[in-house]
Every structure is written in structure tokens, then in C-alpha cells.
């Protein structure tokens, strides 16, 4: 055992940039720190076989399997995967350890399996076995958390039935509005399932696992706050638990709170009250209304009344199935090159949506903001003034929604020219779409002012590059024109751009670009 080399097997996970097939070499990528794979001598095996802990990676992940060998002298090696030999290039690190790497870029099913590394050193031969499998993330779920009352205690339990089991945290804030943003100093996070301090202004519970993070806010009516102009609305699906908190502060304890549904007092066991004195000796009371599993008949106006405050209501709507309400008609926008502009979608949805903005096959993160009227809005400003088609896509498990936007950037044309043996062609992407003129340059017309009336074929919007229209114009060449210079000009309301082409032989031409504003 003392003669055997000290072997360290590690996994390096890369943040994906590019796609390729496995490479047995080092490869420049943004990488996480190496993770030890607990390589150990495999018991009762013929020959010296080291085995690494099984590696499970997501589809499309990029990884490096790496072996570090503490052995004197040179080493030679060979990778074998599915009976194919792969090139192996060992090198030595600063600690003079032999380093052998296998890069797997954009993991696919075909790249999963056993990777065998055969190493030959001056002292001994040995094999290292890596097993790489694809994680079955299809079984993963992340469900929005919900609340339950803790048995025999005035406390709420936050539950999220997710796989893998999520980390549950309460997110508490005692300020109003903007200062309750996630990373604000006013926000306190408690990584536990049970919450006893239920008097705060803003209470949310969040669950997170490998799939992301989902949060649920404790719906609250604050009788000391001015009511919203529109009645607050709470949507729930049949079978979900209902929790509404009514909160009121008064100079002394001489007040009470009650809940009513459609002017009828809630049944015993459907509410519970808590009270406390605040630092300035005023009394805070909260009254929870709850239904462990809502039915259609739980729909209606829930009103919280106080003997010392004006009452306030909320409309609870129970739906069979989730929904996304928004207008899906496509929208076209025309803006100047430096004009500030954001796409915007206003929608009402339950459960909360997950959304993406897509342009040119690239997806961008989607932020959504709740409005006072119960609607939400998602804006996208990161278009960098690139014309084309932008897609907003939203889904929430029950419903899907897609809306298309076209962005046109007003600018003068820019002409590209090319010629073949039989024709000359110009194209331009300016907006509004340009019109074309062709001029002939000759002894009679050195300034190229002689119109070419025939043989011109204009195609407007002949190809749509991610929603970006391109206009082109083609001149069919006659024998008489060969050897002449011609000029194609594209013009729109913002200006004109021209290019000069020599009609002699095929191929891309050097050209002279004139710009006439």
C-alpha cells in the first residue's frame, strides 16, 4: 500500500459558455472550485483500481473529471469510454503532481457512462474509474409554500411540498412599500419552518431548492392604513388553504376585531386572535381568518371590523384552475435610435407566473411587479436598441401566455452590395423600409445621375431576421452594361445611402459608399 501513489480525483463544474464534445485536455472556461470525489482503491478487484464517487450532472452541464497523482517520474495515460480510446495529455502542477483531465462539454445521454483512465508510471500501473450519470431532474418539483396553524400554539408553519426537500425561510419586514425589497436592511430572514412573531407589517415565506425559489405572502388587511382605491383581491384554487390576517393598532386595549364573510360572522374555529403591546404601549391586535381547504362557496367579501377603526374588505375568489389574463395581441413599436423605451405587459394571474423575455433565441430574466389594482406588470428595457421580434412568455402550471412585440428602430438605410455574373444586388435594413433607385455612371453622367429604368427588381422585406425586415433590390445585367459602374441608393425619411458597383466579373466587389443625408 505504501508504494501505491496518492490519488486525488476531483470534479470541476463549468458555467456553460459553448458547446462541444468531450476533450481530453484543459479548456478555458469559467469554473467552480474542484470537488473531491473520494477516490479509493476498489476492494477485491483484479489489479489496482481506484474508484471515484458517482458523479450526477444535469443535462447540458459542462464538467471536467480530473485526477491528481503524487508519483515520482513521468506518467503516461489513456482514457477509455465506451470501448473507444481517447487521447490523454498529462501535465504537472506547481506541486509537481501529475494532472490528467477529461472535459465533457454540454453533457448529453450519450456522454453518460463509465470513464476509465489507465495510468502507467515508472513504479506501477493502475486504473481510475469515473461513473458519470445524468440527474433525473424531471422528478424535481418546487411548490409554492402555504401556511398551517401550529397545533395548540399561536404560530404559523410554512410548508412546501417539494423535491428535493426545500430550505424554508420566513422573510419579515416592518417597513412599508419599497423598503421591503428583498435585499433591504429592513428585511429580516429566519431559516425555520415555524413563525411565532406574527405582528410584523409584511410576512412572507419562501422555499428554495435546486429549481429555484418560490414565495407566498401572508395576505394582510391593515385597518390603520388608508384603504386602496381598488378592493384588494385574493385568488385561490379549490383545495388550497386560505389565510387572511387583519391587523389593527390602538392607543389602548379597548377594541376588538371580527371577521365576516358576506355579512355573516365566521364560524368558531375559522379564526384566531393574538395581541401584544408595542414599544410605545399601544395595543396591536391581529385576527386571522383561515380555511384549511377552500371550496367554491368560500368565495366572497371578507370584512374585518373593529370597534375603533373603519372596517375594510377583501374579495376572495376561488377558482377551479389557475389563469393568466392579459391581452395577447401583438404590438409594434417604432422608436428613435437613442430613445428610452421599455416593453410592458400588464396581466392578472393566479398562481404567480414564471416568465421570460426572448429575443434572437436568447432568453432574458423576467421581473414582475404587483400593482395596487391587483394586476402585475413585467417590463423589458434591455433591448439595446436592436430591432426585431421580442417575445414575452408566461406560465404558472395551469395556464400559458405568449405575447409578441416588434421593435423598429428609425434610422437611415445602410447599403450592402454584391454582384454575380448576371446581376447586381443591394440590400438594406434601415427603417422605415427604404425605396430604391439605380443610376448608371458613364462619360455622359460622371456623377451617376442617369437613371436605370429597366431590369430592376425590388423585394421588400424578403427575409425576416428575428423580426428584422430587410429590403433588397436586384439589377439584372445586360451585355451592354458590363464594365460600367452603377450606383444603388436606398432612401427613407431619415436619409439616403448609396453604393457603387463595377459590373464586370462575379464575386463580392470593393465598393465606394456615398452617403447623402
Amino acid at each position: 500500500n505504501q508504494d501505491l501513489p496518492v490519488i486525488k480525483c476531483v470534479l470541476i463544474n463549468h458555467k456553460n459558455n459553448d458547446s462541444s464534445v468531450g476533450k481530453s485536455s484543459s479548456y478555458p472556461m469559467v469554473s467552480e472550485s474542484p470537488e473531491d470525489l473520494g477516490c479509493a482503491l476498489r476492494p477485491q478487484s483484479a489489479g489496482t483500481v481506484y474508484e471515484a464517487a458517482t458523479v450526477e450532472v444535469d443535462v447540458s452541464a459542462s464538467i471536467t473529471l480530473q485526477v491528481l497523482v503524487d508519483t515520482p517520474g513521468n506518467i503516461s495515460c489513456l482514457w477509455v469510454f465506451k470501448h473507444s480510446s481517447l487521447n490523454c495529455q498529462p501535465h504537472f502542477d506547481v506541486q509537481n503532481r501529475g494532472v490528467v483531465s477529461m472535459v465533457i462539454l454540454k453533457m448529453t445521454e450519450t456522454q453518460a457512462g463509465e470513464y476509465l483512465l489507465f495510468i502507467q508510471s515508472e513504479a506501477t500501473n493502475y486504473t481510475i474509474l469515473f461513473t458519470v450519470s445524468i440527474r433525473n431532474t424531471l422528478l424535481f418539483t418546487l411548490r409554492r409554500p402555504y401556511f398551517r396553524k401550529m397545533e395548540n400554539q399561536d404560530a404559523l408553519v410554512c410548508i412546501s411540498e417539494s423535491v428535493p426537500e426545500p430550505i424554508v425561510e420566513w422573510v419579515l419586514c416592518d417597513s412599508q412599500g419599497e423598503s421591503c425589497k428583498e435585499e433591504s436592511p429592513a428585511v429580516v430572514k429566519k431559516e425555520e419552518k415555524v413563525l411565532h412573531e406574527l405582528f410584523g407589517t409584511d410576512i412572507r415565506c419562501c422555499a428554495r431548492n435546486e429549481l429555484g425559489r418560490e414565495c407566498t405572502r401572508l395576505f394582510t388587511i391593515d385597518l390603520n392604513q388608508t384603504p386602496q382605491t381598488t378592493l384588494p383581491q385574493l385568488f385561490l384554487k379549490v383545495g388550497e388553504p386560505l389565510w387572511i390576517r387583519c391587523k389593527a393598532v390602538h392607543v389602548n386595549h379597548g377594541f376588538g376585531l371580527t371577521w365576516e364573510l358576506e355579512n355573516k360572522a365566521l364560524e368558531e374555529g375559522s379564526y384566531f386572535e393574538m395581541s401584544t403591546y408595542s414599544t410605545n404601549r399601544t395595543m396591536i391586535r391581529i385576527l386571522f381568518a383561515f380555511v384549511s381547504s377552500v371550496a367554491r362557496n368560500d368565495t366572497g367579501y371578507y370584512t374585518c371590523s373593529s370597534s375603533k377603526h373603519p372596517s375594510q374588505s377583501a374579495l376572495v375568489t376561488i377558482v377551479e384552475k389557475g389563469f393568466i389574463n392579459a391581452t395577447n395581441s401583438s404590438e409594434d413599436y417604432e422608436i428613435d435610435q437613442y430613445e428610452e423605451f421599455c416593453f410592458s405587459v400588464r396581466f392578472k394571474a393566479y398562481p404567480q407566473i414564471r416568465c421570460t423575455w426572448t429575443f434572437s433565441r436568447k432568453s432574458f430574466p423576467c421581473e414582475q411587479k404587483g400593482l395596487d389594482d391587483g394586476y402585475s406588470v413585467s417590463k423589458f428595457c434591455n433591448h439595446k436598441h436592436q430591432p426585431g421580434e421580442y417575445i414575452f412568455h408566461a406560465e404558472n402550471g395551469d395556464a400559458q401566455f405568449t405575447k409578441m412585440f416588434t421593435l423598429n428602430i428609425r434610422r437611415k438605410p445602410q447599403v450592402l452590395a454584391e454582384a454575380s455574373a448576371s446581376q447586381a444586388s443591394c440590400s438594406s435594413d434601415g427603417y422605415p423600409l427604404p425605396s430604391w433607385t439605380w443610376k448608371k455612371c458613364s462619360d455622359k453622367s460622371p456623377n451617376c445621375t442617369e437613371d436605370i429604368p429597366e431590369g430592376v427588381w425590388n423585394r421588400k422585406a424578403n427575409r425576416k431576421v428575428f423580426g428584422q425586415w430587410v429590403s433588397s433590390s436586384t439589377l439584372n445585367m445586360s451585355e451592354a452594361m458590363k464594365g460600367f459602374l452603377v450606383k444603388c441608393c436606398a432612401y427613407n425619411s431619415l436619409g439616403t445611402s448609396c453604393e457603387t458597383i463595377l459590373l464586370n466579373s462575379p464575386g463580392p466587389f470593393p465598393f465606394i459608399q456615398d452617403s447623402i443625408s
Epitope: E35, P43, E56, T131
Partner: antibody, heavy 124, light 107 residues
Framework: QVTLKESGPTLVKPTETLTLTCTFS??????????VSWIRQPPGKALEWLAH???????SYSTSLKSRLTISKDTSKSQVVLTLTNMDPVDTATYFC????????????????WGQGTMVTVSS | DIQMTQSPSSLSASVGDRVTITCRAS??????LAWYQQKPGKAPKRLIY???SLQSGVPSRFSGSGSGTEFTLTISSLQPEDFATYYC?????????FGGGTKLEIK
Amino acid sequence: QVTLKESGPTLVKPTETLTLTCTFSGFSLRYARMGVSWIRQPPGKALEWLAHIFSNDEKSYSTSLKSRLTISKDTSKSQVVLTLTNMDPVDTATYFCARMPEYSSGWSGAFDIWGQGTMVTVSS
Amino acid sequence: DIQMTQSPSSLSASVGDRVTITCRASQDIRNDLAWYQQKPGKAPKRLIYAASSLQSGVPSRFSGSGSGTEFTLTISSLQPEDFATYYCLQHNSYPLTFGGGTKLEIK
């Protein structure tokens, strides 16, 4: 360099809940099939295995302490957390966390790397 | 649960002695057994895994044998640094169980 480090209160009152955190580095429970266990050792006594969590989030508990134990992990923070409710003076011990790799050919080398341990005293 | 009976519970020996510690499982655990050495105030250190595989970096005077229900740890020639407590661990099935330990002392 693979390390595991236990942290938590050194003194707990009877009936309280003990929460211990094992923070590890040099490996993860995200990509490699690994597990982390908690083991304890009362002063002058033998080692006692408490709970284990696998990278796929499966859990296993000591039969005698099952009703009082909860093990969980936060992969992104490289932490495994153990809670032991209703603490009693007999729970006074050094608590260790240790790593166990899993190999595809079905064998396991048991715990290959251990934390240094943290001493917890239960007293009123 | 699988019970692990370790014997002897304590043992006095001299430097250079050959020492054997035994672990008996209450049911067949194949070769899913590991041996650990623990010194006072320290964490256990793995010596042997899979009943007979020597941990990398552990001196070859340590060896393990056995399969099924009977297992032994042998130290062929005791060295001063070997005086410690030794534990066996079965990891064939959950819950995992340790032996009661063997305290190896200088005679």
C-alpha cells in the same frame, strides 16, 4: 483540501432544541453522490451514529432517536443541519459530522473524512 | 438493527506485539465494515474499509480480514503511536452501528 466543521451552541438547557451545522468544503452534495452523517460520543463512551443525508435528499435516522431528530441540507451553502429536540443531560456529547462517498459498483468506504467535533453540554 | 459486538473492550500490550481485535455482527453484513482509530480529543480516523482494504497513507502493519459476521483488525507490530481506541462500523444497512470500542493501552 476536504474539511468538515461542526458548529452550534456549547451549552443547551434541558427540553430545548439543539441545532448543529456541519459546514464542509472541498466537495459538494450537488454533483457527486455523497452523504453526510452525524455521529456523537458521550464523554468516555463509544461512538453513536445519529442520522445520514444522501445527495438525493434521502434521509436515515437512528431508531432510538428518530422521533427527536431532523437532518437537512443546504447544497448551495455546503451545509448539513441536525436538530435534536427535547434535550436531556444524557445528550451531553461531542457531536461529529462525517462524509461518506457512494460508488457505482455498490460498495462504500464508510466515513472517509470527519469533522473535528463540537462538544455540547446539556445542563440547567 | 444490526448489533456490533467488539472484543475485547480493553487490551494491554507492548511495543512490538501483534494485536488482534474482533468484531461480530448480529447478521450477515458481507464486507461492509470499516475500522477506525481514535485518540483522545480527536476525531476518528479510518484505517480499513470494505473489511480488508487499507486506507491510503495508513501503515501496512494494520490489516483487516473477515466477511459475513466475523471480522478482525490486526496490528502486526505495535508502535507507540498505535495506543488508542479502535472502533468497527457496519455500513451494510441503516441504521449504521458502531462496535463498543477497544481501548488499547501500554502494558
